[in-house]
Amino acid sequence: DIGISGRHSITVTTVASAGNIGEDGILSCTFEPDIKLSDIVIQWLKEGVLGLVHEFKEGKDELSEQDEMFRGRTAVFADQVIVGNASLRLKNVQLTDAGTYKCYIITSKGKGNANLEYKTGAFSMPEVNVDYNASSETLRCEAPRWFPQPTVVWASQVDQGANFSEVSNTSFELNSENVTMKVVSVLYNVTINNTYSCMIENDIAKATGDIKVTESEIKRRSHLQLLNSKAS
C-alpha cells in the first residue's frame, strides 16, 4: 500500500506479508528519509487495537501508549530509520497478530501513512524420504508445522498431470502447542528414475519437496514461498 496524507505529504510504502507463528516476523514499511533522526516519528497501529503497536521518536522507543498485547515484542531497525526504513520487528508472532496495520510517519518534510495486511499461520519446509519400512516402494513427505490445515498434492515428472490421490495417504497430527500441525503424506508404488514432488499449500504459503531416486543415489530439493506478499 502507498499512502499520502496532509498538506505536506510524504510517501510511505508497505508490503503485505505473513508471519510464521512462534518465530520472529517483519512488517515492512519504508518512507522518504529525513536528514535528522530526532525529527522522525514512527507509529505503528493495528485496526481494532486501542493502544499503539509501537512508537519510535527522537531516536528511541516511546512505549508509554503501547498496547499490552505487543509489550516486549516490538522493535524497529533503529540504525536504518535515518535511511527511511520503518519496518517493525515482531518477536514470537502469535495467531492473533493477524490483521490490518498502519505505518504512520512524521518527518520535517510532512506526514504520511500506509496500511498493510498481515497474515499469520505456520509453514515449514517439507522433507521427502524413501520409506524403507514399507512393503512396496514408498515415499514419505513430512513437514513439521502448518496452519491452517494445508492441502497436499503429489506430482511426478514422468507422469505429468497424473492424479496420485488414490495412491497416497495424508495425515495431520496436532503439535503440542495445540495450534500447528505436523503434515505426513505417503505415496505408494513409486518407480525409480523418476522425480516426485510433494506440494503443501495453504492460504499463506506454498512449499515443495522434490526427490529423485535412481539406482545409485537419492537427490532431494525443497523450497518455500509466501503467497500474497505484494508491494503496493
Epitope: G22, D24, D61, L63, R71, G72, T74, A75, A78, K91
Partner: antibody, heavy 121, light 110 residues
Framework: QVQLQQSGAELMKPGASVKISCKAT????????IEWVKQRPGHGLEWIGE????????KYNEKFKTKATFTADTSSNTAYMQLSSLTSEDSAVYYC??????????????WGQGTTLTVSS | QAVVTQESALTTSPGETVTLTCRSS?????????ANWVQEKPDHLFTGLIG???NRPPGVPARFSGSLIGDKAALTITGTQTEDEAIYFC?????????FGGGTKLTVLG
C-alpha cells in the same frame, strides 16, 4: 536496582518434578522476557526457553519441550520453571536471565545467581 | 540446530587489546542474530556485556565493545584488566531460539 533472585538448591529423586523460582525486583516485570538457561560441566550453556510474563507467551527449545514448563505470576513478580520426569541428565545449574527486546537495546542484562539441581536416588 | 563456535581459550596481558570471536555453522553472523556476549566469573556470577551485536547495557565498562568482523561476531576488550579474567559466552538468535557458544576462557597474565 534490577535483581533476579532464584530459589535454593534442590536434591530430587529420579522421576520426580521440581519447580524453580526466579523473583524479579527493580523493574517492570511484565515487559521483559525471562530466559531459562542450563549449565552442566563440559556442556557449556544451553537455552531452555523463554517467557514474556505480561502475556504468558512462551517459546521452548525443541529439546526441552516435554521437560520444562514456564509460568509467571505478575502479582509477585516471579517466574517459574517446572522440570518433570527428572533423570541424572537434568542435574545441572539452572539460571534465569532478563532479556530486553527493543529498537535500540536488546540484551541479556541481568542474571540470577543460579539454582543447583541434583538428581540422585 | 546451528552450532556456535568460540575459541576455547585465549591469553592476554593487562593493558592489551584482545578480540574474542563467535562463528555460526549456518553461515555469516548478521545483525539479525542479535549477538550477545555474557561474562561468567567464579561462583556462577553472570553479567551481560553486549547485546544486539554492539549494544552495551548500562554499567558495563566502555572497554568492552561488540562488532561483526567478517562473517563472525566479535567481542573486543580494549585495555584488558586483571578482573577481566573470566569465561565469555556468545549467544546467537536464530529466528525462534538462542544458541550459546562453548565459551572462551580468557586468562589475563600478571
Amino acid at each position: 536496582q534490577v535483581q533476579l533472585q532464584q530459589s535454593g538448591a534442590e536434591l530430587m529423586k529420579p522421576g520426580a518434578s521440581v519447580k524453580i523460582s526466579c523473583k524479579a525486583t527493580g523493574y517492570t516485570f511484565s515487559s521483559y522476557w525471562i530466559e531459562w538457561v542450563k549449565q552442566r560441566p563440559g556442556h557449556g550453556l544451553e537455552w531452555i526457553g523463554e517467557i514474556l510474563p505480561g502475556s504468558g507467551i512462551t517459546k521452548y527449545n525443541e529439546k526441552f519441550k516435554t521437560k520444562a514448563t514456564f509460568t509467571a505470576d505478575t502479582s509477585s513478580n516471579t517466574a517459574y520453571m517446572q522440570l518433570s520426569s527428572l533423570t541424572s541428565e537434568d542435574s545441572a545449574v539452572y539460571y534465569c536471565a532478563r532479556y530486553y527486546f527493543g529498537s535500540v537495546n536488546f540484551y541479556f542484562d541481568c542474571w540470577g545467581q543460579g539454582t543447583t539441581l541434583t538428581v540422585s536416588s | 540446530q546451528a552450532v556456535v563456535t568460540q575459541e576455547s581459550a585465549l591469553t592476554t596481558s593487562p593493558g592489551e587489546t584482545v578480540t574474542l570471536t563467535c562463528r555460526s555453522s549456518t553461515g555469516a553472523v548478521t545483525t539479525s542474530n542479535y549477538a550477545n556476549w555474557v561474562q561468567e566469573k567464579p561462583d556462577h556470577l553472570f553479567t551481560g556485556l553486549i547485546g544486539g551485536t554492539d549494544n552495551r547495557p548500562p554499567g558495563v565498562p566502555a572497554r568492552f565493545s561488540g562488532s561483526l568482523i567478517g562473517d563472525k561476531a566479535a567481542l573486543t576488550i580494549t585495555g584488558t584488566q586483571t578482573e577481566d579474567e573470566a569465561i565469555y559466552f556468545c549467544a546467537l538468535w536464530y529466528s525462534n531460539h538462542w544458541v550459546f557458544g562453548g565459551g572462551t576462557k580468557l586468562t589475563v597474565l600478571g
